[in-house]
């Protein structure tokens, strides 16, 4: 759809004659008649196929034409068209003289034509207007034209329809030659698709207007890249939605089972060395001088009865210095200038000479020891207590202080984690090395069965058409991720074919 | 169930400073990014400032940036809102929420809000 527009410029009748060579009385009273037709290679008469026109009296004899298309009047003339341009044309430019006010063609007589011009040719699509002037024996005429296409239509031919829009259609303006051009923030072939923040990750993220970024359940940031891990993670992370991951030293479907209690607590004293032996579970290696589970107590240097042979240990700021009895020298008293003679061996010890009577060796009866007999046996040197368990003396016997989670003699007993029935809403405990698992009822989770979980909203596959289904867990709901094409909460509506609703 | 208790508010004269609380429960606070979000009376909502599940990364808005300072406790599932040099445009509802998305700006969508507490600053 288009305009031809002629615009008339200037029309010379100096000798004011009609065609006949008649002159006008009083003087030839100038309308035009103007027919558009497709192209002929000799013009010929017949019907004006793209449209014709008519203007009023625009002057007498010789006139120029004023431009009055601002104004809104008739000149340049239009001659709308409802085709594609073809590019060619026929064009006829017939002035007439109108001796009365009537200027229909049955009310003029025959003879009232002053004169005739027809052209023909190319004509492209375009702004810019053609001069032309043609000369007859009497009359000249001035004018130009062109062909611009109607509001909304656009191309070489005036054939592309593009209406401009800013709605859930599209949105774009046209270019000149019919193609759309989006709007900022708006892509796609009608311009129907938002551009989301810059970096908004592909599959995590979407956006329904420019510049946001939403995130698909299970994922959250600014660009929806970071995963959100399952719900009661504690010390773990995830690389996709609802994982837990557990960090270094933890573990447990949570990560909340500390298994680096020694880096996490530091329950070593005094430098001690920590290891740890399980689940909350820790054992202290100490350093020499201290002592107890957590190496927390100082020992004094003579408790490990370093003087031998009888000899009495002095404790001192900066060690211990061993009296020795008479026959015994040197830093523990335990060199001898005594022999059997002398009757060394103390609690009923037995005497035998060595290396010809220059030395001696004591036979210890049991509970004795030290190379004179005189050392009651300490029977935690062996540390018979286990799992860590403290070795105390007591006269002719010995007793192991266990850590909490052990008994018997040798603290070699666990106590069962299962005794208090710590399993809630009727999980059943089961006693590991390190402790204890529930095996939770359906409905039920947790180390102890104590939280209530919900029933996973997508075990139903509430989704359509090959949609991906993702549960919320803090919300117990589904979410359908759907796939190219589909939309709707269930993804159960194809793209284009508007959802059929009850109301 | 997921709960957001926001505390704090209160009245405060212009160039004052208030601190606000919110309590979570009901979710893995330490696994969720959170906003501060504000609702001034007749208008919108308007994104205050937001800090990721860490606390390590932290946003704020042009018209409180350098006076308001978000910040996080995981330990104890409470998110702060440390405001200073506090002016009568300042007046509004707090609500604090975990988004859902974000614009050009901060976060616009929320998943979850508070039921809010009034911060009015008045001589």
């Known amino acids: 759809s288009g305009v031809f527009q002629l615009q008339l410029q200037e029309f010379i009748n100096e000798r004011g004659v009609l065609a006949s060579g008649r002159p006008c009385e009083p003087g030839c009273r100038t309308f035009f008649r103007v027919c558009l037709k497709h192209f002929q290679a000799v013009v010929s008469p017949g019907p004006c196929t793209f449209g014709t026109v008519s203007t009023p009296v625009l002057g007498t004899n010789s006139f120029a034409v004023r431009d009055d298309s601002s104004g809104g009047g008739r000149n340049p003339l239009q001659l709308p068209f409802n085709f594609t341009w073809p590019g060619t044309f026929s064009l006829i430019i017939e002035a007439w003289h109108a001796p009365g006010d009537d200027l229909r063609p049955e009310a003029l007589p025959p003879d009232a034509l002053i004169s005739k011009i027809a052209i023909q040719g190319s004509l492209a699509v375009g702004q810019n207007w053609l001069l032309d002037e043609q000369t007859s024996t009497l009359t000249r005429l001035r004018y130009s034209y062109r062909v611009i296409c109607s509001d909304n239509y656009y191309g070489d031919n005036c054939s592309r329809l593009c209406k401009k829009r800013n709605d859930h259609f599209g949105h774009y303006v046209c270019q000149p030659d019919g193609n759309l051009s989006c709007l900022p923030g708006w892509t796609g072939e009608y311009c129907q698709q938002p551009i989301c923040l810059s970096g908004c990750h592909e599959q995590n993220g979407y956006c329904s207007k420019p510049a946001e970024c939403l995130c698909r359940p299970g994922w959250q940031g600014r660009l929806c890249n970071e995963c959100i891990p399952h719900n009661g993670c504690r010390h773990g992370t995830c690389s996709t939605p609802w994982q837990c991951t557990c960090d270094e030293g933890w573990g447990g479907l949570f990560c909340d089972q500390d298994l680096n209690y020694c880096t996490h607590h530091s329950p070593c004293k005094n430098g001690a060395t920590c290891s740890n032996s399980g689940q909350r579970s820790y054992t202290c290696t100490c350093r020499p001088g201290y002592t107890g589970v957590d190496c927390e107590l100082e020992l004094s240097e003579c408790d490990s009865n370093p003087c031998r042979n009888g000899g009495s240990c002095k404790d001192q700021e900066d060690g211990y210095h061993c009296l020795c009895p008479p026959g015994y020298y040197g830093l523990h008293c335990e060199h001898s200038t005594l022999s059997c003679a002398d009757s060394p061996c103390f609690n009923g010890g037995s005497c035998r000479e060595r290396n010809q009577g220059a030395n001696y060796a004591c036979e210890c009866p049991p509970n004795f020891t030290g190379s004179n007999c005189e050392k009651k046996v300490d029977r935690c040197t062996s540390n018979p207590c286990a799992n860590g368990g403290q070795c105390l003396n007591r006269g002719p016997s010995r007793m192991c202080r266990c850590r909490p989670g052990f008994t018997g003699t040798y603290c070699e007993l666990h106590v069962s984690d299962c005794a208090r029935n710590p399993c809630a809403h009727g999980g059943t405990c089961h006693d590991l090395e390190n402790g204890l698992m529930c095996t939770c009822p359906a409905g039920f989770s947790g180390r102890r069965c104590e939280v209530r979980t919900s029933i996973d909203a997508c075990a139903s596959s509430p989704c359509f058409n090959r949609a991906t289904c993702y549960t919320d867990l803090s919300t117990d709901t589904f979410v359908c991720n759907c796939p190219y094409g589909f939309v709707g909460s269930r993804c159960e509506f194809p793209v284009g074919l508007p959802p059929s609703f009850p109301w | 169930e997921v709960q957001l208790v926001e505390s704090g508010g209160g009245l405060v004269q212009p160039g004052g400073s208030l601190r606000l609380s919110c309590a979570a429960s009901?979710?893995?606070?330490?696994?969720?990014?959170m906003s501060w979000v504000r609702q001034a009376p007749g208008k919108g909502p308007e994104w205050v400032s937001a800090?990721?599940?860490?606390?390590?990364?932290?946003y704020y808005a042009d018209s409180v940036k350098g006076r308001f300072t978000i910040s996080r406790d995981n330990a104890k599932n409470t998110l702060y809102l440390q405001m200073n040099s506090l002016t009568p445009e300042d007046t509004a509802v707090y609500y604090c929420?975990?988004?859902?998305?974000?614009?050009?700006?901060?976060?616009?969508?929320?998943?979850?809000w508070g039921q809010g507490t009034q911060v009015t600053v008045s001589s």
């Open positions: 929420a975990i988004p859902r998305g974000w614009g050009p700006t901060g976060p616009h969508e929320y998943a979850y």
């Open positions: 009901g979710f893995t606070f330490g696994s969720y990014d």
């Open positions: 800090i990721n599940s860490g606390g390590g990364s932290t």
